[in-house]
């Protein structure tokens, strides 16, 4: 886990102050408003998760 001001999070993750850890950019599909998703902006946007088929 990354502490603020140290080495960046690993590829595919971004620092979350809310969670106090590196968080997976993949989760921005389901929770696009998460605080760390701005740091994931380099990744192409994915469609939002369907609740039901």
């Amino acid at each position: 886990e990354q502490a603020p001001g140290t080495a960046p999070c690993s590829r595919g993750s971004s620092w979350s102050a809310d969670l106090d850890k590196c968080a997976d950019c993949a989760s921005c599909r389901a929770r696009p408003h998460s605080d760390f998703c701005l740091g994931c902006a380099a990744a192409p946007p994915a469609p939002f998760r369907l609740l039901w088929p």
Partner: antibody
């Protein structure tokens, strides 16, 4: 250290009711969706219900098998999640686990509480 | 609902060898960037534990002996070299949409 403690299981007759509780600690509870998942030899692992956050107006989602009979709720002030189960059937017999998920992964699991529906 | 089919249902692998478990989804659970597939380990008498998320990312504290791969509908969990403590049942789970579903499990025995 993350801790999840389920309770409230036991033996209940068909058609009866039961309320399960889960107390959580060691992670930012108010930021996590909470799930109930059950496990039986017949059906394996089966997702039951999910409750989201205050900012989502505590939106709830249920498996088809739980709709109309089960109600999930949470109390953020107590870092707790509940599952009210009504009109219980023999096929609801299982170990019930609570599990937090930020979005996709069931990051932690409690020890489970056993529910037996039998006459 | 998305159906996840695991194979084999059980396998026995010699200590130090490779265990390979397959999970096939009834529809794609991947975008061009990520795959929404997880793997869990459940040791006898214990609760499930997250091993791998998003098809290939190890959860914190999981040994590098475990690896996951795949996209679309076909996913694989590999364990190499297997150790005694890997005796467990392994489950895949998707998070593409609700309802979340799990595979039927693969029981791994170490010879």
């Amino acid at each position: 250290e993350v801790k999840l403690g389920e309770s409230g299981g036991g033996l209940v007759q068909p058609g009866g009711s039961m309320k399960l509780s889960c107390v959580a600690s060691g992670f930012p509870f108010t930021k996590y969706w909470m799930n109930w998942v059950r496990q039986s030899p017949e059906k394996g692992l089966e997702w039951v219900a999910e409750i989201r956050l205050k900012s989502d107006n505590y939106a709830t989602h249920y498996a088809e098998s739980a709709k109309g009979r089960f109600t999930i709720s949470r109390d953020d002030s107590r870092s707790s999640v509940y599952l009210q189960m009504n009109n219980l059937r023999a096929e609801d017999t299982a170990i019930y686990y609570c599990s937090p998920t930020y979005a996709d992964t069931m990051d932690y699991w409690g020890q489970g509480t056993s529910v037996t529906v039998s006459s | 609902d998305i159906v996840l089919t695991q194979s084999p249902a059980s396998l026995a692998v010699s200590l130090g060898q490779r265990a390979t478990i397959s999970c096939k989804a009834s529809q794609s659970v991947s975008t061009s960037t990520y795959s929404y597939m997880q793997w869990y380990q459940q040791r006898p008498g214990q609760s499930p534990k997250l091993l791998i998320k998003y098809a290939s990312k190890l959860d914190s504290g999981v040994p590098a002996r475990f690896s996951g791969s795949g996209s679309g509908t076909d996913f694989t969990l590999n364990i190499h070299p297997v150790e005694e403590e890997d005796t467990a049942t392994y489950y895949c789970q998707h998070s593409w949409e609700l309802p979340y579903t799990f595979g039927g499990g693969t029981r791994l025995e170490i010879k």
